[in-house]
C-alpha cells in the first residue's frame, strides 16, 4: 500500500485537453498509474498513463479529440481517478468530480510578432491557441518585458483587462535588445489559472538618429 500525502490537480484547456498532475509522498517511481476520465453525459471514457516528472509527482494529458474540437461544456462533470497497479489489481489513489469550466488553464499564446518598432516603442501582436468560442471576449492577458541586466521575475507585469491581442510598449531605450512574453486567462472559473507564459519574442529597438535629441 502507498502512504503519504496525495494531491491530484487537473486543468482543462477549454477545448480537447485535460492536463493532470498527481503528487504522492512515498509512492514508487516504477508503479504503473493511469488517470481515468468518466464524463457524466458523454459516451466516451479516456485514460492517460501518468509519467514521472519529479521524485514524487507524475503528469499526463487526457487528449479528448482534435485540438480545436469542443469536447466539454459548462454543464459537464467528469469523474477523474488516479489508478495504480498493485500486483494484478488496480487501486484508486485519488478521485475528483471535475468541472472543466471551473478549472481552466489555456494554452500559451502563440505567433508573437513585432508589428512595428521604433527607437522608444514597439507594437507586438499575438494569437490565442485552442481557446473555446464560449469565452467570446471574456479573456484577460498579462505581459512582461525583459530588459538588459534584469530577470523575468523582476519584470513588471502589464495587465490587459480585455481580449486585446496586441500591445504597444513605450519608454524603451534605443538600440536595445528586449524580450517579451504574454499569458492569458479566462474570467470564468473558480479555480481557473493563468496559462503558461508564451515563448519569448526577442526584438531590438531602432538606434537613435545621429545628431538628434532622444
Amino acid at each position: 500500500a502507498v502512504n503519504g500525502t496525495s494531491q491530484f490537480t487537473c486543468f482543462y484547456n477549454s477545448r480537447a485537453n485535460i492536463s493532470c498532475v498527481w503528487s504522492q509522498d512515498g509512492a514508487l517511481q516504477d508503479t504503473s498509474c493511469q488517470v481515468h476520465a468518466w464524463p457524466d453525459r458523454r459516451r466516451w471514457n479516456q485514460t492517460c498513463e501518468l509519467l514521472p516528472v519529479s521524485q514524487a509527482s507524475w503528469a499526463c494529458n487526457l487528449i479528448l479529440g482534435a485540438p480545436d474540437s469542443q469536447k466539454l461544456t459548462t454543464v459537464d462533470i467528469v469523474t477523474l481517478r488516479v489508478l495504480c497497479r498493485e500486483g494484478v489489481r488496480w487501486r484508486v489513489m485519488a478521485i475528483q468530480d471535475f468541472k472543466p469550466f471551473e478549472n481552466l488553464r489555456l494554452m500559451a499564446p502563440i505567433s508573437l510578432q513585432v508589428v512595428h518598432v521604433e527607437t522608444h516603442r514597439c507594437n507586438i501582436s499575438w494569437e490565442i491557441s485552442q481557446a473555446s468560442h464560449y469565452f467570446e471576449r471574456h479573456l484577460e492577458f498579462e505581459a512582461r518585458t525583459l530588459s538588459p541586466g534584469h530577470t523575468w521575475e523582476e519584470a513588471p507585469l502589464l495587465t490587459l483587462k480585455q481580449k486585446q491581442e496586441w500591445i504597444c510598449l513605450e519608454t524603451l531605450t534605443p538600440d536595445t535588445q528586449y524580450e517579451f512574453q504574454v499569458r492569458v486567462k479566462p474570467l470564468q472559473g473558480e479555480f481557473t489559472t493563468w496559462s503558461p507564459w508564451s515563448q519569448p519574442l526577442a526584438f531590438r529597438t531602432k538606434p537613435a538618429a545621429l545628431g538628434k535629441d532622444t
Partner: nanobody, 123 residues
Framework: EVQLVESGGGLVQAGGSLRLSCTVS????????MAWFRQAPGKEREFVAT????????EYVDSVKGRFTVSRDNAKNTVYLQMNNLKPEDTAVYYC????????????????WGQGTQVTVSS
C-alpha cells in the same frame, strides 16, 4: 472515426521472425491505448499484447512473453508487434485494436478493430 490498417503478416518457418505494423488514421493517435489480438482457426479471438498511450507500459499474454515485443511510434501513428522465435501455434489472423480507455482494451466488444493480417508459421 478512427481507422486501423494492419500489415506485415506472411508465411514464416518456425523459429523465424515477423514484424507487424498497424497504422491509425482519422483521429488523434496518442488518445488511444493500442493492442494486438489474434484468432486461430476454430478458436476465439484472444488478447496478445497492449501498449499504453505513452508507450511506457506494455503487457503480454503469458504464451508470448519473451518472444513478442509491442511498441508504438506516436509521430508515425503506428503500433508494432515484433514477433521472434515464432511457433506453429502462433498461426492466426492478427488484429490491431484501439480504445481510448486503457481499462477496456481487453474487452472485445469495446474496441475499434483493423481488418487483420494473416500469420502462418510452418514447422
Amino acid at each position: 472515426e478512427v481507422q486501423l490498417v494492419e500489415s506485415g503478416g506472411g508465411l514464416v518457418q518456425a523459429g523465424g521472425s515477423l514484424r507487424l505494423s498497424c497504422t491509425v488514421s482519422g483521429d488523434v493517435f496518442v488518445r488511444y491505448t493500442m493492442a494486438w489480438f489474434r484468432q486461430a482457426p476454430g478458436k476465439e479471438r484472444e488478447f496478445v499484447a497492449t501498449v499504453t498511450d505513452s508507450g511506457r507500459t506494455t503487457e503480454y499474454v503469458d504464451s508470448v512473453k519473451g518472444r513478442f515485443t509491442v511498441s508504438r511510434d506516436n509521430a508515425k501513428n503506428t503500433v508494432y508487434l515484433q514477433m521472434n522465435n515464432l511457433k506453429p501455434e502462433d498461426t492466426a489472423v492478427y488484429y490491431c485494436a484501439a480504445n481510448t480507455d486503457y481499462f477496456r482494451i481487453r474487452s472485445l466488444d469495446a474496441n475499434t478493430w483493423g481488418q487483420g493480417t494473416q500469420v502462418t508459421v510452418s514447422s
